[in-house]
Structures are given as C-alpha cells and as structure tokens.
C-alpha cells in the first residue's frame, strides 16, 4: 500500500492503489548535496549521477572505521525520497550528488559553498533545464553560506533546505535562514511537528512549510534492494525538493518567487498542533504542511500572496523590524504586532527601489514586528499614498486617487507614546472602499496599485464586547491583501495575515472592560485579478 | 534575514594604520567585519572564508590572496590558500592562525571574514 | 553509446569452472549494477544475481548455492561471473544486462559443459 | 519468490492484427514489471518499463498497462519484425523473476 507519506502530500484525484502522478518530474535536474550514495541501489539505479564533487572533513575520533553502508546512509535515502522509483516522490526526476559530508554525517560551511560554487559552474558550462538544490544540512547561522545560496538564488536555482532538527528557532541556522531558500520542517503521519529524541524540528518565520518527516520508508544503502525507515528535516526538505520537481517539470518557467507561492497555496492549511511550538513562535511558525498541486496546470489565474514576519525589533523605544518581499514580489500591505501592545504602528517606505514594511516599537514596548504581505501580481505599479495626522475628530483618511488605482493595504504609524488610550474609536465612513481611515494623531498610509484586471473589496468583521482575537476571511476566488484594525481600539496587539484570514489580535480581555474600548473590527483588503484568470482560459 | 538574528556573533575589528604601506588602501571609512559560529563546538578555527566586495574579479581575488600570504610571511606566520572562489562569491578559503585577522581585515576588497564551521546531516 | 560486450564462446568439462567477462561502456557505471541472466537451449530467461560496481556487494540467486561468484572491476568497467564445479545443466548462453531494469543486454556467451 | 504466469504460451497471428499479452503475478508488485522482446540467437531488448513506459527507440505499436498483479502488453497492429518471443519480469522483489515467454508466430 501507499507509505503515508505519499498519500498525504497527494491530492485526492491523484490517489489510487500507487503513487504515479502524471509526469514525474523528467525535465528537472535535482542536486543533492550530502554524504556519498549508493547510486547502483535498485530504487535509484540510473537516475543519480554521483560528480566527482567531494569536499568532506576527516571523521572524528581514532578509533572511526569507515563502513561504506553507513557512509552512504544518509544519501541513499534522501535520493530515494526525492526520486526513488517505489517510495519516491518525483519518480521520473534525475539527480546530481555532491559529497560534502563525511561517513558521520559532517561537513563545513566552506565545503558547502565550493559545492554551491561547483553548481554554479556547471550550470554555466552546460545549461539544462530547471534546477533544484537541495541541502539536507545545517549549521549555526552563517553570512557567507546564506550570502552563497542568495546568489544561486538569483541566477535561477531553487534551493530547497531542512529546517533543522534542534527544536529551535530555524533563524538560527544556516542555509534554513536564507530567506532565498525554501526551508523545510517535519511533521508525521498525524501532522505533528516531528520529535526526534529529546529534540525536534525547527520552527520559526524561517521556515516556509512542513512535510512528512517521520517514519519516511526509502532506499536503504545496507544492501541495493533494501529499504529503511528515517526521519528528519532533511527528509522534508526531500519531499518539497521532489514536489517542486514535478512543479518546475510541469511548468519550466516558474520563477523561485511563483514556485514558492504555489507551494503555499497547495499546502495542507491549519492542521498542524501549535501547541508544540513555543508560545511565542507560535504566531511565527506557518500552519503548512506541502502537497502536491491538484492540477499542475491552470494555477496561474490565481493572485498568489504570502506572509512574511520580520525578526524581532528588540525592545529599545526607537527600534524598528523590517519585512521584505522577495525580488518578484509586491508588498500590498503592512501590518505591525507587539505581544505587550506597545507599539507605535507601521509604515511602507522605499529601501534600495523596493517598498518594505517597517513597525516601530514604543516606549517600554518589548518589541516589534513587521508583517509583509508579498503578492505574485505582474505588471503592477503600486505606490504609497501617505496623509499626515489630522488632528480631526474625524481621524485622519487617505485614499487612492490616481485612475485605475485599488486599495490593496493600509499601515497607520503615529509619534505619540500611547495613542488615544481613552478616546472613543473613529468609525469608518462606509461606501468608500478605496479609503484608508486611521486615529486623528496617526500617519496613514495607503498601498495603492494598478494592474491589468485587478479589482479589491473591503471587508470587515466586529465584535463589539473584547475578544482577543477576531478574524475576517476573504472568500473564495478572492485573495487576502491587506489585514489591519479600525482605530481607535488601544488594546489592539496588531494584525496579521494567516493564508486568507486577517487575524487582529487583542489584549488579554481579562485585563480589558468590556467598554466601547472593548469593540474591534478586523479590516480585510479581497483581491482578486480578473486579468489573470482571463490569461489562463486563454491558455487552455 | 538580516543579521539582526538572535544568537550570530559579529566581531567588527576597527581598522588601525599599520607599519605596511597597502598599494589599495581600503576606502575611507569603511571596516570589514568578522564573524564565527555563535555555536563553540562546531567552530572550526584556523580556516578562514575571506569574502570580497561584489564587484571583484578573480584576478583580485588572487591577489588579495597571496598578498595576505606575503604579509604573513614577513610576520612569521605560514598561511595556506586552500580554495579561491568566483562564480557565486568572489573570496577565498584559507588556512591561518587567527593571529592574522586583524590583517586580513584590512586588505583591499575585504568584506568580511568568516571563521569556517561544521554542518550536519538532518 | 551504451552497451555490454561479452567475451567469447567456452566449451568446458563438468566440473570446471568458467569465468565469463561483461565490459560496459557509454555510460557511468557506479550508477548501476550488473544482472547475470541465463537461457538453456529452448528455456526462457533465468536470473543468476546482481554485482555492484559501486562497492562490489553482490545478490545472487539461491539457485546457484554458492557455486557462482560475481565481481566488478571499477577501473576497467569489467564486471566477471565465474561459475565453478560445472554440470551438464549449465549449459546455456549467460547474458550480462545493466542494473536490475535490464534495460541493455550484452551479446551473450555460450557456455558449452560436456565430456 | 515471485511467480510470473504468462499467457498465452504461444500465439498465431497475422500482420496487421492487434495482439495481446498478459502477465499475472503472485503477489501485487506495483509497478515493477518489463517486457522484453527476443529473436532467435539475440540477447532480449527491453520494450517496456514500469508497466507502461515504452523505451526509447520503441515503436508505438507497443503499448503496457496494468499495476498489482495483472499486466497487459498490447501490439496494435502486427509487423512482420514483431514476430518474437515475449517475456515479463517483475524486479519489485530479489530474485527478480521472469515470465515463461509468449511466443508470436506467423499464421
């Protein structure tokens, strides 16, 4: 029967009594940079080409003896995973092994970066079709080893990596904390975050989905038809390595950005125990376990968008957070929250030609963060429209007015410590969606953006006695862009975008009367691209 | 991410004038930074990752190199060029006392140093 | 491009050995193994084991009850069958074919077993 | 070990007609099957893999199906050079074992 790894990142139309998806990935060249395989093993026999790359370190310990079947271990099982006939996700992909870890299962950041480098070169040499990198390792947190995959990054390659398996922050380590690679954590058989002795997976902002992780059957080097259980980040970051085969082999031309977004958008939503996470890396971590796409094509009417948290601003009074988009990416909104309450808003600016999302912390705050809602919208020019504070009963507004502009995102930032503590909430005046509406004493600012087809809609949700957390959720064939609070509320923690839900959270409402002060209204931003799908039919 | 991540150590050695005259002096104002594995067991001193600015060739690259060599030599100190990259980053891996950072740090096109460290299988 | 090529025809007493050799070319050997397959004069095709270049292991079929001994030689991409204490019934043409998929056969050699 | 059951032993037909060739085996094997033409005094040639991926270089005409236990290999439309002994072999489990052979004879 199918290993439940298989069926679990299989769509429903996919499943039979075996695992054969339509094209498997035939047109995509994987690299697989890990310890030495055994290539002739009958699970992989002719799809792995073994370089001649070795850049490994001596084994620890005198007494070490190399036995080849252990020496192999690690990769076998990983290009099993990946491409295996059997147990395979991407059973037509082919592979390129780079040894860069020894018969332990070590390596260094510079064997890595000449292996990286050795890609590059051979990508030069001989150009093939899409690439795939996938880095089954970790280390501590390295400028130089992330600075190298941002470069592979950028000339085309996708680069897929283990989280890690320290039960940690994933931002820790490297290559998971490039923000150019896809990074992968564990989950199991009931979509929860994998335990690994006294550890686990990593979790964190750093990490963009899960995937099977536990008790992954694939080819074992102890003999050329065995088979062997493993379990581990690295066998995650396998099964995206492999997904994103069968993605690229179905659609070549996908960019590292759109091949990203889609892996979000076919994950499994929301059914992971966060529970496992700490508290405060909770709201971090993303609720996604990998799939495949149910169709491999025809995705590409959908307006794509993800979210992106910064790292912690710290908690000096003038510290700000940061959150980027990739290169291909638009920011449509930005969005600030702070565990404490304190904070003093968030703003979109332009840094090096590119809009970011900054969030400001507040005196006696603990500390910021960004959120960065990063959307696939092509031919877009967005721009953001900024109204000073009124000083106006009416609290301060700022719409779109340039012609075939929409209102995708709105971010408030405000200089004063506390803003409007005990002062009634502003209502916002209905019937004018394309309009920004924030507290009299806050700057507002608009993302405001025309793109062939595209059309927005607001919507919102109050609850008028204190909840700590209310949500609005766009609907179907519509994507969520913007996610903010009306003003006025002062015990609003922030807001956040989680797939299509705006999420604005609130203080503890033990701490809070149940006054008007008590009411809040989650503000959503709906989008969709009526030129995208127009496209796609085209296409079909 | 940014470097504002938790654990990283970061080590800015400020640049001081010293006795050798460098033909290519670093521009003014700028200091090269160095950086090594907040996690102490799995720091591997003694190999160094010498990056260089973006924009820099091979040829300098080599030369950066063995520049480094010839300084360290006149100081005593024997050092080994084991790798010198270009296509993804230009820099070169090179085997040395730490002793020698503080001139390493100064030597045209540096960017940053990178004390090397381990990675392991997941 | 790919192929195995065997070497020659043997005629042997029962109770002799034979050494048959298969030298691949036009591919990366460590990529696959080596299957030995068998045919009797009128029979179908029997499977005699498999030998690895890679690191030399070897599967073989319980038939032969530790008479066969398959091995490979890396530097040379030769890959031996050696069949010991032969029978009459080891009469037959053995074929060498890549990996387990046998997706390329050799020419085959007949090996001739009579008094 | 794994019994491969062919049908039909042999088989008369003329060129032109579709032919077809069935494979049972003794457990579920997935997809790990080959089919495999051979000539008289030549080494087989693989036609198909995995059930149903025809070779590179392979006419067509030759087409696989099936996935468990039961396999089918299918000729369309019988050429002269078609005329051959047939084998399957499952290589989901060691030993990997091969059918009796089905042989194609002229009418």
């Known amino acids: 029967s199918i290993p439940w790894n298989l069926e679990r990142i299989t769509p429903p139309r996919y499943r039979a009594d075996e695992y054969q998806p339509p094209d498997g990935g035939s047109l995509v060249e994987v690299y697989l940079l890990d310890t030495s395989i055994q290539s002739d093993h009958r699970e992989i026999e002719g799809r792995v080409m073994v370089t001649d790359f070795e850049n490994v370190p001596e084994e620890d310990g005198t007494r070490f003896h190399r036995q080849a079947s252990k020496c192999d271990s690690h990769g076998t099982h990983l290009a099993g995973v990946v491409s295996g006939r059997d147990a395979g996700v991407a059973k037509g992909a082919s592979m390129r092994s780079l040894r860069v870890l020894n018969c332990q299962g070590k390596g260094t950041v510079s064997g890595t970066l000449i292996g990286l480098e050795f890609i590059r070169k051979s990508q030069l040499v001989q150009p093939v079709g899409p690439l795939v990198v996938l880095l089954p390792l970790a280390g501590g947190y390295s400028r130089v080893l992330n600075a190298a995959c941002q470069r592979l990054a950028r000339a085309g390659v996708v680069l897929v990596t283990a989280a890690g398996n320290f039960r940690d922050d994933a931002c820790l380590y490297s290559p998971a904390s490039a923000p150019e690679v896809i990074t992968v954590g564990a989950t199991n058989a009931q979509d929860q975050p994998v335990t690994l002795g006294t550890l686990g997976t990593n979790f964190g902002r750093c990490v963009d989905l899960f995937a099977p992780g536990e008790d992954i059957i694939g080819a074992s080097s102890d003999c050329s038809t065995c088979f062997v259980s493993q379990s581990g980040t690295s066998q995650a970051a396998a099964h995206v390595a492999g997904i994103a085969a069968m993605m690229l082999s179905a659609e070549p031309e996908l960019t590292l950005a759109e091949l990203r977004q889609r892996l979000i958008h076919f994950s499994a939503k929301d059914v992971i125990n966060e529970a496992w996470f700490p508290e405060d890396q909770r709201v971090l971590t993303p609720n996604l376990v990998a799939a495949l796409p149910p169709s491999t094509h025809g995705a590409g009417w959908q307006l794509f968008c993800r979210t992106v948290w910064s790292a912690h601003s710290g908690p000096t009074r003038m510290a700000t957070a940061v959150a980027r988009c990739a290169p291909d990416e638009e920011l449509l909104s930005c969005s600030s929250f702070s565990r404490s309450g304190k904070r003093r808003g968030e703003r979109m600016e332009a840094q090096g030609g590119k809009l970011v999302c900054r969030a400001h912390n507040a005196f006696g705050g603990e500390g910021v963060y960004a959120i960065a809602r990063c959307c696939l919208l092509p031919q877009a020019n967005c721009s953001v429209h900024t109204a000073p504070p009124a000083e106006a009963s009416m609290g301060t507004r700022v719409h779109c007015h340039q012609q075939g502009h929409v209102l995708t995102g709105c971010s408030s930032h405000w200089e004063v410590e506390d803003l409007g503590t005990h002062k009634p909430p502003v209502l916002r005046p209905r019937g004018q969606p394309n309009q920004c509406v924030g507290h009299r004493e806050a700057s507002i600012h608009a993302s405001c953006c025309h793109a062939p087809g595209l059309e927005c809609k607001v919507k919102e949700h109050g609850i008028p006695a204190p909840q700590e957390q209310v949500t609005v959720a766009c609907e179907e064939g519509w994507t969520l862009t913007g996610c903010s609070a009306l003003p006025g509320t002062s015990h609003v923690l922030g807001a956040y975008a989680v797939d299509n839900t705006c999420v604005v959270r609130s203080r503890d409402v033990s701490t809070t009367g149940s006054t008007s002060e008590g009411a809040v209204t989650a503000v959503a931003i709906c989008c969709r691209s009526r030129h995208l799908a127009q496209a796609s039919q085209e296409l079909q | 991410q940014e470097d504002e991540d938790g654990d990283y150590e970061e080590l800015v050695l400020a640049l001081r004038s010293e006795e050798d005259g460098l033909a290519e002096a670093p521009e003014h104002g700028t200091t090269a930074t160095f950086h090594r594995c907040a996690k102490d067991p799995w720091r591997l001193p003694g190999t160094y990752v010498v990056v260089l600015k973006e924009e820099t060739h091979l040829s300098q690259s080599e030369r950066t190199a063995r520049r480094l060599q010839a300084q360290a030599a006149r100081r005593g100190y024997l050092t080994k060029i084991l790798h010198v990259f270009h296509g993804l980053l230009p820099g070169f891996l090179v085997k040395m006392s730490g002793d020698l950072l503080e001139l390493a740090l100064k030597l045209p096109h540096v960017d940053y140093i990178e004390e090397d460290s381990s990675v392991f299988a997941q | 491009q790919v192929q195995l090529v065997q070497s020659g025809a043997e005629v042997k007493k029962p109770g002799a050995s034979v050494k048959v050799s298969c030298k691949a070319s036009g591919y990366t050997v460590t990529s696959y193994g080596i299957s030995w397959v068998r045919q009797a004069p009128g029979q179908g095709l029997e499977w005699m084991g498999w030998?690895?270049?890679?690191?030399?292991?070897?599967n073989y079929a319980q038939k032969l009850q530790g008479r066969g001994t398959m091995t490979t030689d890396p530097s040379t991409s030769t890959a031996y069958m050696e069949l010991r204490s032969l029978r009459s019934d080891d009469t037959a043409v053995y074929y060498c074919?890549?990996?387990?998929?046998?997706?390329?056969w050799g020419q085959g050699t007949t090996v001739t077993v009579s008094s | 070990d794994i019994q491969m059951t062919q049908s039909p032993s042999s088989l008369s037909a003329s060129v032109g007609d579709r032919v077809t060739i069935t494979c049972r085996a003794s457990q579920n094997i997935n997809s790990w099957l080959n089919w495999y033409q051979q000539k008289p005094g030549k080494a087989p040639k693989l036609l198909i893999y995995g059930a149903s991926s025809r070779q590179s270089g392979v006419p067509s005409r030759f087409s696989g199906s099936g996935s468990g236990t039961d396999f089918t290999l299918t000729i369309s439309s019988l050429q002269p050079e078609d005329f051959a002994t047939y084998y399957c072999?499952?290589?989901?489990?060691?030993?990997?074992?091969f059918g009796q052979g089905t042989k194609v004879e002229i009418k």
């Open positions: 074919a890549r990996g387990y998929s046998l997706d390329v």
């Open positions: 072999q499952q290589w989901f489990d060691v030993p990997t074992t």
């Open positions: 030998v690895s270049f890679y690191n030399g292991n070897s």
